[in-house]
Interface confidence: low
């Protein structure tokens, strides 16, 4: 697949920004900020949770999350998983792009520790045109957000 | 913003290393290197540990802080934050971009115990001309430096 | 060096995976899947491991290692070093180019808990025709593949 | 300029050994790899092996593994391959070459010795 | 191994013709591939590497071109020194290996 730049040609690119609305509990992806502060879309859509590509190539994507708590609540998991997946009209099911598996709740020894961690992601993928990437946390309830500094999510054609 | 790339144009890039220098403890940004070993810039400028844009446009803009020590030091914070901040002529007081916070002290669970965590941010921002983006470590004790592969600081544009 | 992006040029660019073939345990560095799945070669080659640059410029480099474990095993160093190292005709010996050191293992207080951490690095290096980029992790047994998504290295001029 | 002067025809019985020589001028020998081609009559380039004659490093390929040996002698900038346990079908040209870029890069091969034709005769 | 396979094998051309050689890898080599050409009796000689770098001293009529598993040899306009047998060659792994040859013959 031979990808060009040609002149006067805008690169797709985006940045998403974590907000109060990022966390559904609904087992879905996070949900993200595109126009205030920071956030932006260039070249690329966004649709509940995910950026769509409009035009196919490789593309840098990245996420950053902010990981937080006190002590280790009872029934969380120890391993966090973060993680950029793709749709795609062409299979049924999420496909895994690039996954970290964290377990920060064990660096607080006393249970009325507070802790942060923080993942970040990225890395090149092939997108064609109407696939979607979205960011999922499990477990989401340790995600801190605030201002749209600490958890975001962005891509830019390379 | 339309944003283009034009044919046969420098895309605006800098990688930025950590040196003896970069710990002040003034409170200020940290300093780096700017010429020697793999510390460069190209189509981007420098002033007191800010990378300063002379092209306005959107950049991936990524930072490294090495961290380390032994135990857990008296008074010393149990939060390390690293963030990326902009200064522009628009605003008197820094804007945080992307920001990080980490507890890698509480890995350590006796006092004499040496641990080692590291810090990455990376995202895309709109920067103007003019505009600079400094590195901020807050407890900066705790930032390790050597031969500058383990903290840096540095853009291109997307 | 003045490198610029003409018109219709394909910009170099690969995204490798991690396999069960990547842990060697020779002392030498990542082998990585470069054609299944997620991997991919453009305008890049790639050798034993190494990333290797068929045309000059600045590049961002990044790669991603998931670390896992039970405990600490006896023998196991407390520091994970995980690197970018360039290998070059004019030195006999690899350089640091980019380098993290972590002390995930000190998060699991009793010996059979398990626990997980994930180290990521990129940045910007300038690279000639024919030099070379590797992947090191010391100790690379802490290294824990599946399925290409989260262990991996990549490279795309910028 | 860059030169690669390879030892004479050689006539060999099946089971003996050989060895060519390689000497290298013009350049700084111990900079570049030297690797090692051969081509039987009428067939295509088949590759035997490199050394990187700077810290004696070797690569061989797995089908000539423990009969080729590769050396280096950096006083006379001389290469050599050594081939043992002769048969019939290792009669062919054999050739050394310089590869382009210098120690761990990979391309390809941009001088070449006018090659030495061997022989494997009962 | 990595298998190269050129064709056409043989190729009957006349001076001034344009000539094309292709060479097809058995796997993806990225741009690892390296073109040479032979003389009787002579060593070959490099013309291309990297796909579509052309050594020193190598006329602009050659050309490369290719990545991943196709890759193409051109020769603009065919000069009477240029009848040899061409070989492809990649390097992205081991063991190194080259194409079967094409033969180009005088029409």
């Known amino acids: 697949l031979i990808q060009e730049r040609r002149s006067h040609e805008v690169n797709p690119a985006a940045h998403l920004t974590g907000a109060n609305s990022s966390l559904t509990g609904s087992g879905g992806p996070l949900l993200w900020e595109t126009q205030l502060g920071l956030a932006f879309l260039r070249g690329l859509s966004y649709h509940d949770g995910a950026l769509v590509v409009t035009k196919a190539g490789y593309y840098y994507i990245y996420s950053k999350v902010q990981l937080g708590g006190v002590g280790c609540p009872l029934g969380l998991a120890s391993t966090i998983t973060h993680g950029l997946y793709k749709r795609t009209p062409r299979y049924p099911e999420e496909l895994e792009l690039l996954v970290s598996q964290q377990s920060p709740c064990g660096r607080a020894t006393s249970s009325s520790r507070v802790w942060w961690d923080s993942s970040f992601l990225g890395g090149v993928v092939h997108l064609e045109a109407g696939e979607k990437v979205v960011v999922r946390v499990l477990d989401e309830r340790l995600v801190r957000l605030r201002d749209g500094t600490r958890s975001y999510f962005g891509a830019f054609m390379v | 913003l339309i944003q283009e790339r034009r044919s046969h144009e420098v895309n605006p890039a800098a990688h930025l290393t950590g040196a003896n220098s970069s710990l002040t403890g003034s409170g200020g940004p940290l300093l780096w290197e700017t010429q020697l070993g793999l510390a460069f810039l190209r189509g981007l400028s420098y002033h007191d540990g800010a990378l300063v844009v002379t092209k306005a446009g959107y950049y991936y803009i990524y930072s490294k802080v090495q961290l380390g020590g032994v135990g857990c030091p008296l008074g010393l914070a149990s939060t390390i934050t690293h963030g990326l901040y902009k200064r522009t002529p628009r605003y008197p007081e820094e804007l945080e971009l992307l920001v990080s916070q980490q507890s890698p002290c509480g890995r350590a669970t006796s006092s004499s115990r040496v641990w080692w965590d590291s810090s990455f941010l990376g995202g895309v921002v709109h920067l103007e001309a003019g505009e600079k983006v400094v590195v901020r470590v807050l407890d900066e004790r705790l930032v390790r430096l050597r031969d500058g592969t383990r903290s840096y600081f540095g853009a291109f544009m997307v | 060096l003045i490198q610029e992006r003409r018109s219709h040029e394909v910009n170099p660019a690969a995204h490798l995976t991690g396999a069960n073939s990547s842990l060697t345990g020779s002392g030498g560095p990542l082998l990585w899947e470069t054609q299944l799945g997620l991997a991919f070669l453009r305008g890049l080659s790639y050798h034993d491991g190494a990333l290797v640059v068929t045309k000059a410029g600045y590049y961002y480099i990044y790669s991603k290692v998931q670390l896992g474990g039970v405990g600490c095993p006896l023998g196991l160093a407390s520091t994970i070093t995980h690197g970018l190292y360039k290998r070059t005709p004019r030195y006999p010996e690899e350089l640091e180019l980019l380098v993290s050191q972590q002390s995930p293992c000190g998060r699991a207080t009793s010996s059979s808990r398990v626990w997980w951490d994930s180290s990521f690095l990129g940045g910007v290096v300038h690279l000639e025709a024919g030099e070379k980029v590797v992947v090191r992790v010391l100790d690379e047994r802490l290294v824990r593949l599946r399925d290409g998504t989260r262990s991996y290295f990549g490279a795309f001029m910028v | 300029q860059v030169q690669l002067v390879q030892s004479g025809a050689e006539v060999k019985k099946p089971g003996a050994s050989v060895k060519v020589s390689c000497k290298a001028s013009?350049?700084?020998?111990?900079?570049?790899?030297i690797h090692w081609v051969r081509q039987a009559p009428g067939q295509r380039l088949e590759w035997m092996g490199w050394?990187?004659?700077?810290?004696?490093?070797?690569k061989y390929n797995e089908k000539f593994k423990g009969r080729v040996t590769i050396t280096r002698d950096t006083s006379a900038s001389t290469a050599y391959m050594e081939l043992s346990s002769l048969r019939s079908e290792d009669t062919a040209v054999y050739y050394c070459?310089?590869?382009?870029?210098?120690?761990?890069?990979?391309?390809?091969?941009?001088?070449w010795g006018q090659g030495t034709l061997v022989t494997v005769s009962s | 191994d990595i298998q190269l396979t050129q064709s056409p094998s043989f190729l009957s051309a006349s001076v001034g013709d344009r000539v094309t050689i292709t060479c097809k890898a058995s796997?993806?080599?990225?741009?690892?591939v390296a073109w040479y050409q032979q003389k009787p009796g002579k060593a070959p000689k490099l013309l291309i590497y990297w796909a579509s770098t052309r050594h020193t001293g190598v006329p602009s009529r050659f050309s490369g071109s290719g990545s991943g598993t196709e890759f193409t040899l051109t020769i603009s306009s065919l000069q009477p020194e240029d009848f040899a047998t061409y070989y492809c060659?990649?390097?992205?792994?081991?063991?190194?290996?080259f194409g079967q040859g094409t033969k180009v013959e005088i029409k």
């Open positions: 070459a310089r590869e382009d870029y210098g120690i761990s890069t990979y391309s390809a091969m941009d001088f």
């Open positions: 796997q993806d080599v990225g741009t690892a």
């Open positions: 050394i990187f004659p700077g810290s004696d490093i070797t």
């Open positions: 013009g350049y700084t020998f111990t900079s570049y790899y």
């Open positions: 060659q990649q390097y992205s792994s081991y063991p190194l290996t």
